[in-house]
Structures are given as C-alpha cells and as structure tokens.
C-alpha cells in the first residue's frame, strides 16, 4: 500500500529568457528515495541517484541545473519549454510516485506563480 503524497509547485508561469525552479516533495511515507527522475513529456531531463548523484541529459546540459535539493532549475526559457514536467520518485519499498507540474512560458512580462497542489 502506497501511503505517500507528492506536493509540487503546481501550475506555474515564467517569462521567456528567464529561469524557473521545479520542485516536488514526497511526504507521508517512511519509504527511502533511491532515485528521482525529472521528465518533460517523454524526454528525460535529469536524474538524481542516491549512489551516483546528479546526471543531466546531454541535450539539456546548457539550460538545466540541478537543485535546489531534489528540484530542477530551468534557465534561458523559451516558449517551447511550455508543457508538462514530471518528477518521478523511485522509492523502496513503495515503488514509484509521480508529481506533475505545468509550466507556461510567457512572452509578456506578466508571469504569475500558481498555487501549490497535491497529487496522491
């Protein structure tokens, strides 16, 4: 039985050319996190592994920075970065927990952050 929940930064928006932090947090479980994957649609952005630390996919190396914590910082944002992002927590013994964040990259200078929400 998986008792944990993932809290994410939810629906967020940011300005073109700027940067944004994607954050997830796993709670309500004593499971041990063994790895966290960050994905954009079907593309792997980065991995944070308990043994090996961070690995950023080569195609994103210039624009993705690890952290803070298990989060991910996206830099030099373009309109093409708009879309769904997923944090995938691999845990023992529970298995996999997934959180979803929707990022909208705006041309204008008005970019407001959405409220946090939880995914069970």
């Amino acid at each position: 039985m998986m008792t944990g929940t993932i809290e994410t930064t939810g629906n967020i928006s940011a300005e073109k050319g700027g940067s944004i932090i994607l954050q997830c947090h796993l709670s309500s479980t004593t499971a041990q996190v063994t790895q966290v994957n960050w994905e954009q649609q079907d593309q792997l952005l980065a991995i944070c592994n308990a043994d090996l630390g961070w690995h950023i996919s080569p195609s994103f190396k210039d624009r993705v920075a690890p952290g803070p914590g298990l989060g991910l910082t996206l830099q030099s944002l373009t309109v093409n970065d708009t879309g769904e992002y997923f944090c995938i927590y691999h845990t023992y013994p529970d298995g996999t927990y997934t959180g979803r964040i929707f990022l909208e990259v705006l041309e204008s200078s008005v970019a407001e952050h959405g409220a946090r929400f939880q995914i069970p």
């Epitope: 041990q32 996190v33 063994t34 966290v36 592994n49 308990a50 043994d51 298990l70 023992y92």
Partner: antibody, heavy 121, light 108 residues
Framework: EVQLVESGGGLVQPGGSLKLSCAAS????????MDWVRQAPGKGLEWVAE??????????NYGESVKGRFTISRDDSKNTVYLQMNSLRAEDTAVYYC????????????WGQGTLVTVSS | EIVLTQSPATLSLSPGERATLSCSAS???????LYWYQQKPGQAPKLWIY???TLASGVPARFSGSGSGTDYTLTISSLEPEDFAVYYC?????????FGQGTKLEIK
C-alpha cells in the same frame, strides 16, 4: 566483503557523553541508509536512530527514548556513521549495533558486531 | 508508536517439526515494511525475511513469511538444528521504528 565495524563504546558515568563510530566497507555507503540499533543485556532489540541518504536530504529520525539526547550523523567521504550520545543514563547500557540498508534492485541489510556501552557510576 | 507483540515468547519444538511464530501489530503495518531477524547468542541479528515474505539471501526455503495489516507469521516447515535461535519481527512503516520482544525457538 561487506564490513561494518563499530567503535567508541566503553564505560561512562551517568550524565556523561560518548561518541560511537561505524566504519563501513564493501558496499556503496553513500547510497545506504544507516541505523543504530541497541540491545540491553539479556533483552530484545531497540531501534535508536537512522540517517538517510543525500537524495533523502540526509534526514534523521530517532527513537522516543533517545530524542534530544542522541545525534546521528554521517560522513560519506569517510564511509562512516556516528552516534553522539549525551546525558547518558543507566538504561542506555547496551550493545549498540550499526546497520546499513541498501536497495539497488535488490535489498541488502548489513549489521556490525556491536560495541558495548556501559553507563554506571 | 506501533507495538509489535510476538507469540509465543518461547517455543519448544523438536527437529523435523513445524514452527509457527506470530507477530501482532497494535496498528496496521504496510507489508513491505515488515521484517524478521534471526539472532543467535553472541551474534548480531541477521535479516531473515523482508517485505513480509521475501527470504533474505542464503535463507533456506523451509522458511516462509506471510500476513498483512496487523497480523504477520513466520513459518518453518521442518525444523533443522541450526534454526534454533531468537526471531524478532520489525516494522519501519511508521516512526518510531519498532521491534517485537522476540520469540525464542528452543530444542525440546
């Protein structure tokens, strides 16, 4: 060969302090979550504390009887976990075991042979 | 705190007999978090069964584990001389982690 070697045990007076060390080898220490478990003479096992991995923010958790008195820490560069024990009481007298657990597709659970802590005046 | 109560405290059996050790939890434990350890005199405990029913490396197939919720069981189908020891159940489903008081399996 996996080894966990505890050290630092001994005789200490009530109210005193002691720092236990557990040196690990033979497995990927940085990916292991580490615990201290104790066993009073002739008694059962009691969980004392744990420290998680970096990906778990090195989170620490404690048993009720030691909370606020004991501190667990780790040095991944030295493959060592520590237990700082303050305000020791007679009831802390026990063999203290270091335990390491690791999951990398298979689950592993390793124990040291223990170090005896005696709290007595 | 989840209290684990093991029964019986002592179990006296002969080699070849079947042994059933019980572990009852004061509140529900997720099955992935229920472990059994074996300990012999003067030795450190050894992981015996994890995740309720998975045998640790090197544990003979005569051992099995089962259960869910608040009731868990370790079974030995036919006792061998080396099986006589103390067995502890352990949960890490919620803080603080706890152990049962142990069942001593002794030769009759």
């Amino acid at each position: 060969e996996v080894q966990l070697v505890e050290s630092g045990g001994g005789l200490v007076q009530p109210g005193g302090s002691l720092k236990l060390s557990c040196a690990a080898s033979g497995f990927t220490f940085s990916g292991a979550w580490m615990d201290w478990v104790r066993q009073a003479p002739g008694k059962g096992l009691e969980w004392v504390a744990e420290i998680r991995t970096k990906v778990n923010n090195h989170a620490t958790n404690y048993g009720e009887s030691v909370k606020g008195r004991f501190t667990i820490s780790r040095d991944d560069s030295k493959n060592t976990v520590y237990l700082q024990m303050n305000s020791l009481r007679a009831e802390d007298t026990a063999v203290y075991y270091c335990r390491g657990a690791l999951y990398d597709g298979f689950y592993f659970d390793y124990w040291g042979q223990g170090t005896l802590v005696t709290v007595s005046s | 705190e989840i209290v684990l109560t093991q029964s019986p405290a002592t179990l006296s059996l002969s080699p070849g007999e079947r042994a059933t050790l019980s572990c009852s939890a004061s509140s529900s434990v997720s099955s992935g978090y229920l472990y059994w350890y074996q300990q012999k005199p003067g030795q450190a405990p050894k992981l015996w069964i994890y995740g309720t029913s998975t045998l640790a490396s090197g544990v003979p197939a005569r051992f099995s584990g089962s259960g869910s919720g608040t009731d868990y069981t370790l079974t030995i189908s036919s006792l061998e001389p080396e099986d006589f020891a103390v067995y502890y159940c352990h949960q890490w489903s919620s803080f603080p982690y706890t152990f049962g008081q142990g069942t001593k399996l002794e030769i009759k």
